[in-house]
């Protein structure tokens, strides 16, 4: 369960890939599209509001007999719109929604090497936001092999 309904902290940050491509958001035909692209030097990076929530993970679920806490995030590039996992389509989409946000809008935060982070779907453990064909997609990751995969690594810069 997510502890409380309010985030423990929030920050505005630009999101980029391990290879320094920017994640950008564009309004097209009354819906938002998400792009992964090289930005021209003078172009300002899009900012995302990251809201961080603490999630209690009871020992009955954790499998190691320990009550643990996870850090979860929601990502909102513009008012009332949040990134959401569409597990059926293996896609990442921007949806307008009201609070309380659906579980599909929550991602477990992982710290990685090179000061990068990864975002794991709350609704589908082992599935991460990643980059595929210059778009964001959901990527299934084999824990034993690919946790360092560059396509699921992202940089946050305030």
């Amino acid at each position: 369960s997510i502890t409380g309904i309010s985030p423990i902290t929030e920050s505005l940050a630009s999101l980029s890939t391990y290879n320094d491509q920017s994640i950008t958001f564009a309004l097209e035909d009354e819906s938002y599209e998400i792009y992964v692209e090289d930005l021209k030097k003078d172009k300002k990076k899009d900012k995302v509001l990251l809201s961080y929530y603490e999630s209690q993970h009871p020992s009955s679920e954790s499998g190691d007999g320990v009550d643990g806490k996870m850090l979860m995030v929601t990502l909102s590039p513009t008012k009332d719109f949040w990134l959401q996992a569409n597990n059926k389509e293996h896609s990442v989409e921007l949806h307008k929604c009201e609070k309380p946000l659906p579980d599909q809008a929550f991602f477990v935060l992982h710290n990685r090497s090179f000061n990068c982070v990864s975002f794991e779907c709350k609704t589908d453990p082992g599935v991460f936001i990643g980059v595929k064909d210059n778009h964001l997609a959901l990527i299934k990751v084999d824990y034993s092999e690919n946790l360092g995969s560059e396509n699921i690594l992202f940089k946050l810069s305030e």
Epitope: T9, L109, N111, L147
Partner: antibody, heavy 121, light 106 residues
Framework: QVHLKESGPGLVAPSQSLSITCNVS????????VHWIRQTPGRGLDWLGV???????SYNSALMSRLSISEDISKSQVFLKMNDLQTDDSAIYFC???????????????WGQGTLVTVSA | DIQMTQSPASQSASLGESVTITCLAS??????LAWYRQQPGKSPQLLIY???RLADGVPSRFSGSGSGTKFSFKINNLQAEDFVIYYC?????????FGGGTRLEM
């Protein structure tokens, strides 16, 4: 009950290497990162590196060329190896566990008791 | 690397009083700051994480505040066991650097 315990050689000769083992219990290395920190009266607390859940490793770049961190998940052990020790590497070496699953943003919730390493001929 | 400047280096206080310790980061670290205390001959103990959150089992007379680059740590109603060393640590980016410590003296 979460428990971490370091075991090291105590005394190391200059230019030799240091190996310390961190034995952990009460939690899974597949969920929590384990960090190495050292403490000296002169320099205070220095973060050395981390073995993250999932096996990726980050090092303090100032010491990266001399450091190696590894694990044996089946034995719930994390290892620190440091090469070419000098007298100013004399310190108490600690291992510590992340507060959060998968993330270091919440600090280090559990620490080992530390092991004193003295570098001397 | 992010430098953490902790002040004062030492402070005197009496039982029952309040004290405040400050930590300044050389660049913005959001809310990713922890506070620890260390008793002589022991390992550090987490008191505050994410700048303001009280760690499990820590009394409510301890509190933290701040974000970005300036952070504060306050102890109300000082007890005998509080006269030890306190450290801040940034966890925004590696290397996860510590402040130089504050020794609280009676």
């Amino acid at each position: 009950q979460v428990h971490l315990k370091e075991s090291g050689p105590g005394l190391v000769a200059p230019s030799q290497s240091l190996s310390i083992t961190c034995n952990v219990s009460g939690f899974s290395l597949s969920k929590y990162g384990v960090h190495w920190i050292r403490q000296t009266p002169g320099r205070g607390l220095d973060w050395l590196g981390v073995l993250r859940a999932g096996g990726t490793i980050s090092y303090n770049s100032a010491l990266m060329s001399r450091l190696s961190i590894s694990e044996d998940i089946s034995k719930s052990q994390v290892f620190l190896k440091m090469n070419d020790l000098q007298t100013d590497d004399s310190a108490i070496y600690f291992c510590a566990r992340d507060h959060y699953y998968y993330s270091s943003f919440g600090g280090f919730a559990s620490w080992g008791q530390g092991t004193l390493v003295t570098v001397s001929a | 690397d992010i430098q953490m400047t902790q002040s004062p280096a030492s402070q005197s206080a009496s039982l029952g009083e309040s004290v405040t310790i400050t930590c300044l980061a050389s660049q913005t670290i959001g809310a990713w700051l922890a506070w620890y205390r260390q008793q002589p001959g022991k390992s550090p103990q987490l008191l505050i994480y994410a700048a303001t959150r009280l760690a499990d089992g820590v009394p409510s007379r301890f509190s933290g505040s701040g974000s970005g680059t300036k952070f504060s740590f306050k102890i109300n109603n000082l007890q005998a066991e509080d006269f030890v060393i306190y450290y801040c640590q940034q966890l925004n980016s590696t290397p996860y650097t510590f402040g130089g410590g504050t020794r609280l003296e009676m």
